[in-house]
Interface confidence: low
């Protein structure tokens, strides 16, 4: 028997520095976790102790903090090279800055193979990108070889900006011929490494003949065997074993997100490449693991540019941006409108001629808006200003909800109106009218939503049975501020871009902004 140790990360989302336990900015260093310096310490410790080790990343290194905003992927290539990753799969967020924003900083600079079998380039891009990413790579490990085949969510055109010259094929259909090719090359140990979410990971394990192990990402799935070491609740045991359709036991793993854990899986293969045992657990990268001093020094060096960036002007406002709790928790506020408009703008994807856009709606809990921005400072808006408005380091995500769920959410928005509570919703692409004289749970008297399947967008009444796409903070998607109905009833959830980055990009694009209060939220006569 031959033993392989797979170390893996996924959905790191530019958490290069250590973070707090909830993956936001590190405040108390003695209680902080993750970061590439600490990751390197643990990886090196395992490399020294065990003979056959692979370090893999399942995508979405891009997007999530000011590191990505400033360095645009150069930081990913630099520090992944420093950690000597063996391979990476492309995630949807790797396309956030378009194909050029992937090719130049990452694909051309990475010293490790970057993989995806189900992304096919066409047109002029085909020759430009040829060889910069691969469907699979055969890696020598000790005296053996291991095949790594990559895959990426086929929803990427709806979630990011891959352009029109990349075709995202069905993962299973695309993976099978590549795995077959590896088999003909006498590679009998094959890892599928990819970024399509836990459900697809399990399906790949089940349906793609010849795959021995699946290392996934995208769904931020936490798996653990035994008592979990932090706040994350396991979605299943680690590894999660799938019985394939040809009767094999295939381990499937994922390591939560944000570099908080290092996935650690030990696999035993027989001489024909069959998996005969697998075990392990994610390793919590807490402060008991010291940060590697050389990597830490490098981080500090790169950090300097970030501090300068925070105070640079992104754009100007010629109006007061009212982000006060007195406004945003009680009525439509123009800061809420600005943020929602930025959220929709960030999700413009013209993937279908029938639709002007795939999503038109935004909801945002008023309690998530933490500060106004005064226009009397020469109108200047900086990253620092936005960090005061949106201090929680969240993301603006894409969900699919039934109309009935949205109706419940808007009822919840005003169920205890008047107490300055955070659940009051700010909106975009929605016109809502409340009657506060009615009893809680029955206060929404009008709810119109902006059409998507139309050439001239207009507002139509919400249909209870229709499925709508909505952009909202990850906080709401996870049921925060009492929006349990969103968490329980959402039909799909894809994590999006860093909240501050979305708003800063929009302001930079617009240069001068002047959001108004324009009647998105109304109260029927006599009740307010």
């Amino acid at each position: 028997a031959w033993e392989l140790t797979i170390l893996h990360t996924n959905d790191v989302h530019s958490r290069l520095e250590q973070t707090s336990e909830d993956s936001s900015k590190c405040v108390n260093a003695s209680r902080c976790m993750g970061g590439v310096a600490r990751l390197f310490t643990k990886v090196q410790q395992i490399r020294r102790a065990e003979p056959n080790v692979l370090l893999l990343d399942a995508g979405d290194q891009y997007q999530g903090t000011i590191w990505f905003t400033v360095y645009k992927g150069a930081e990913v290539a630099h520090f992944m090279n420093a950690l000597r990753y063996d391979a990476m799969a492309l995630g949807n967020h790797e396309f956030d800055n378009g194909v050029e924003g992937l090719i130049e900083p990452l694909l051309k600079e990475a010293k490790f193979p970057i993989l995806s079998a189900n992304i096919k380039a066409k047109g002029p891009l085909a020759s430009q990108i040829s060889g910069l990413y691969l469907p699979y790579k055969v890696l020598p490990v000790g005296d053996e070889v291991v095949g790594i085949v990559g895959y990426t969510s086929k929803e990427t055109p709806f979630l990011s900006n891959p352009g029109t010259n990349l075709v995202f094929e069905d993962e299973i259909t695309a993976l099978q011929p590549e795995v077959d090719k590896l088999k003909t090359l006498n590679v009998n140990k094959i890892i599928a490494l990819g970024h399509s979410g836990f459900e697809m990971d399990k399906l790949i394990a089940q349906k793609v003949r010849g795959v021995d192990v699946v290392v996934g990402g995208h769904s931020n799935t936490f798996l653990y065997t035994g008592n979990p070491p932090s706040k994350e609740v396991p979605a299943g045991k680690y590894p999660f074993i799938v019985t394939s359709d040809d009767g094999r036991k295939v381990p499937v793993v994922q390591a939560y997100a944000f570099g908080k854990y290092l996935g650690y899986l030990k696999i035993e293969f027989d001489e024909r490449g069959n998996v005969i045992s697998s075990h392990g657990n994610p390793i919590l990268l807490n402060s008991s693991i010291p940060e590697d001093p050389s990597i830490k020094a490098d981080i500090n060096k790169w950090r300097i540019k970030l501090d300068n960036y925070s105070t640079q002007e992104l754009g100007k406002t010629i109006v007061y941006l009212d982000g006060s709790s007195q406004s945003c928790r009680f009525r439509e506020c123009n800061m809420g409108n600005l943020i929602c408009d930025a959220m929709i703008n960030n999700n413009l994807r013209h993937t279908d001629e029938m639709f002007w856009n795939h999503v038109s709606m935004c909801i945002l809990n008023g309690g998530g808006i933490r500060s106004p921005i005064d226009e009397r400072n020469n109108g200047t808006i900086t990253w620092e200003n936005l960090a005061a408005v949106l201090p929680f380091g969240g993301t603006f995500d894409l969900v699919q909800l039934k109309g009935s769920t949205l109706k419940k959410a808007f009822e919840h928005s005003v169920h205890r109106y008047g107490q300055s509570t955070g659940e009051f919703l700010q909106v975009g692409g929605i016109h809502v009218v409340y009657d506060l004289s009615r009893k809680p749970g029955d206060r929404v008297v009008k709810l119109d939503v902006l059409c998507t399947k139309c050439r001239v967008p207009s507002y139509d009444p919400l249909k209870m049975d229709e499925v709508y796409k909505v952009i909202l903070p990850n906080f709401l998607a996870n049921g925060g501020d009492g929006f349990q109905m969103i968490k329980d009833e959402l039909l799909r959830h894809d994590s999006g871009d860093q909240d501050i980055n979305v708003v800063s990009t929009y302001i930079s694009k617009m240069k001068v902004i002047y959001p108004a209060v324009e009647g998105r939220i109304k109260f029927s006569t006599g009740s307010h």
């Epitope: 086929k154 055109p157 995202f168 094929e169 069905d170």
Partner: antibody, heavy 118, light 107 residues
Framework: QVQLVQSGAEVKKPGASVKVSCKAS????????IYWVRQAPGQRLEWIGW????????KYNEKFKGRVTITADKSASTAYMELSSLRSEDTAVYYC???????????WGQGTLVTVSS | DIQMTQSPSSLSASVGDRVTITCKAS??????VAWYQQKPGKAPKLLIY???TRHTGVPSRFSGSGSGTDHTLTISSLQPEDFATYYC?????????FGQGTKLEIK
């Protein structure tokens, strides 16, 4: 329950085009593939192509490439298969089918007879 | 393209008989074979996929076996409603291909 209801029989002249529809109900249309398969009189079944309405991922059998177009209208939960430059050997019953998590052609429409005759 | 060849092309049997239909692939299709039943004027109905997994609602008298190039559909005890045409299909690689069919008739 899962239902796929296809459009009615068509008679076409050689060189013309035909567009067959397949209306899905009883499940979330965007979550499953729709496949198109045809069966000429007394012949074996022949796979034409597929569409994944969730992201409009489409794949065609090379044999039909250039003549077939598969589309989907998500709002109407309907898939379409258009075959152009019809010839007499295209006379067949055209079926749409849906997959499930494990099987390719798990649920079938009732079929649409397309007759190509001058 | 992978060719799927069924045998026999037709066969006569009686109610209660055990019947075996074979399907030979022109190349290794592993366990990626499905079987369908079709009655005149009707759409095919999925019986078995991945060689031996019965689709929902398919009676246990239908079973599949095989791997590589040789696959078999067995009906352990024929019932009156089983007289139909049966097709094998490979879902190992695109283009998906079907056998020419085996017509099962009442003796």
């Amino acid at each position: 329950q899962v239902q796929l209801v296809q459009s009615g029989a068509e008679v076409k002249k050689p060189g013309a085009s035909v567009k067959v529809s397949c209306k899905a109900s009883g499940y979330t249309f965007t979550n499953y593939y729709i496949y198109w398969v045809r069966q000429a009189p007394g012949q074996r079944l022949e796979w034409i192509g597929w569409i994944y309405p969730g992201n409009l991922n489409i794949k065609y059998n090379e044999k039909f490439k250039g003549r077939v177009t598969i589309t989907a209208d998500k709002s109407a939960s309907t898939a379409y298969m258009e075959l152009s430059s019809l010839r007499s050997e295209d006379t067949a019953v055209y079926y749409c089918a849906r997959d499930d998590n494990y099987a390719w052609f798990a649920y079938w429409g009732q079929g649409t007879l397309v007759t190509v005759s001058s | 393209d992978i060719q799927m060849t069924q045998s026999p092309s037709s066969l006569s049997a009686s109610v209660g008989d055990r019947v075996t239909i074979t399907c030979k692939a022109s190349q290794d299709v592993s366990t990626a074979v499905a079987w369908y039943q079709q009655k005149p004027g009707k759409a095919p109905k999925l019986l078995i996929y991945w060689t031996n997994t019965r689709h929902t609602g398919v009676p246990s008298r239908f079973s599949g076996s095989g791997s590589g190039t040789d696959h078999t559909l067995t009906i352990s005890s024929l019932q009156p409603e089983d007289f139909a045409t049966y097709y094998c299909q490979q879902h190992y690689s695109t283009p998906f291909t079907f056998g020419q069919g085996t017509k099962l008739e009442i003796k």
